[in-house]
Amino acid sequence: LCQGSNYSTCASCPSCPDRWMKYGNHCYYFSVEEKDWNSSLEFCLARDSHLLVITDNQEMSLLQVFLSEAFCWIGLRNNSGWRWEDGSPLNFSRISSNSFVQTCGAINKNGLQASSCEVPLHWVCKKCPFADQALF
């Protein structure tokens, strides 16, 4: 498993766990079932990963290829401003919202959408590959 922060950049290396997809320098898990935002977060953390934190537009565009109209939870929340779970602000993309109660972030092939955190959705986890050292 990666050493250090869950949010570190990983070096290239081959292996991801079963049912995880290797993409660039990370492993991604696209869920089949649906959970609310908190349960999705817990699922990822229990597997030494985190709910998807997108670092830039390029990563977002690449991931959207694998998405449909259906929304997936990602590691994005509105706590006095939209922030990723690693604490960084959302600054490379806009998020659609229509209500103050929509404080959790989701993604589909069209972009980012705010939602009530209690909606059951698919989710995406992200982690470093096996036997890799995180780069700091």
């Epitope: 908190n38 929304f71 659609s96 919202s97 229509n98 209500s99 103050f100 109660v101 404080t103 989701a106 959408q113 939602s115 009530s116 955190c117 209690e118 909606v119 959705l121």
Partner: antibody, heavy 123, light 107 residues
Framework: EVLLMESGGDLVKPGGSLKLSCAAS????????MSWVRQTPDKRLEWVAT????????FYPDNVKGRFTISRDNAKNTLYLQVSNLKSEDTAMYYC????????????????WGQGTTLTVSS | DIQMTQSPSSLSASLGERVSLTCRAS??????LNWLQQGPDGTIKRLIY???SLDSGVPKRFSGSRSGSTYSLTISSLESEDFVAYYC?????????FGGGTKLEIK
């Protein structure tokens, strides 16, 4: 028919406490976020609190945070507002409102309102 | 907080007249705006949601529109039961905020 019925309003001394209730019927209560909104004597409407459908998430404005607590009992189809450390400026008619169903893209908020219950804070 | 500036605060008009009430938002709220009607007994009823969608059971003489940050409620031909109070409500941003209200009075 959607019905919201508030109760529990009373005359309370400054610093006192009270619990307001809102009985809901005519819809699946556990699927909806719910809110309290008050109307001050000068007829201004102010949002007081919102609670998510399961009760896990709550939202408050700064002026009531720490003094007011919104809660719900989905088994009883009832919304509550515990008000404490009351001030004269909390004097108002308190309304409960159905605030939105738990879905992703949704635009239908604050659609039904109760008839209100009066809270008067005075010594 | 987003300020909703509603005007006029009161309006005298005649039966059959066309009137427009406006709310101006201090920040972008998209289409996240409702228009509410409050009767003399204090009962609150939503007329318009998401800027321009008419609630079921609301007469077609009521309509909502938007131009930039200014939102309007138009009553095409006033009837006697329309002479009550009206409020706008933005629900995009926390805290949700209301306009100061417009009291519609019969001339």
């Amino acid at each position: 028919e959607v019905l919201l019925m508030e109760s529990g309003g009373d005359l309370v001394k400054p610093g006192g406490s009270l619990k307001l209730s809102c009985a809901a019927s005519g819809f699946t209560f556990s699927s909806y976020d719910m809110s309290w909104v008050r109307q001050t004597p000068d007829k201004r409407l102010e949002w007081v609190a919102t609670i998510s459908s399961s009760g896990r998430y709550t939202f408050y404005p700064d002026n009531v945070k720490g003094r007011f607590t919104i809660s719900r009992d989905n088994a009883k189809n009832t919304l509550y507002l515990q008000v404490s450390n009351l001030k004269s400026e909390d004097t108002a008619m308190y309304y409960c409102s159905r605030t939105g169903v738990t879905t992703v893209v949704f635009t239908d908020y604050f659609d039904y309102w109760g008839q209100g219950t009066t809270l008067t804070v005075s010594s | 907080d987003i300020q909703m500036t509603q005007s006029p605060s009161s309006l005298s008009a005649s039966l059959g007249e066309r009137v427009s009430l406006t709310c101006r938002a201090s920040q972008d709220i998209g289409n996240s705006l409702n228009w509410l009607q409050q009767g003399p007994d204090g009962t609150i009823k939503r007329l318009i949601y998401a800027t321009s969608s008419l609630d079921s059971g609301v007469p077609k003489r009521f309509s909502g529109s938007r131009s930039g940050s200014t939102y309007s409620l138009t009553i095409s031909s006033l009837e006697s039961e329309d002479f009550v109070a009206y409020y706008c409500l933005q629900y995009l941003s926390s805290p949700p905020t209301f306009g100061g209200g417009t009291k519609l009075e019969i001339k």
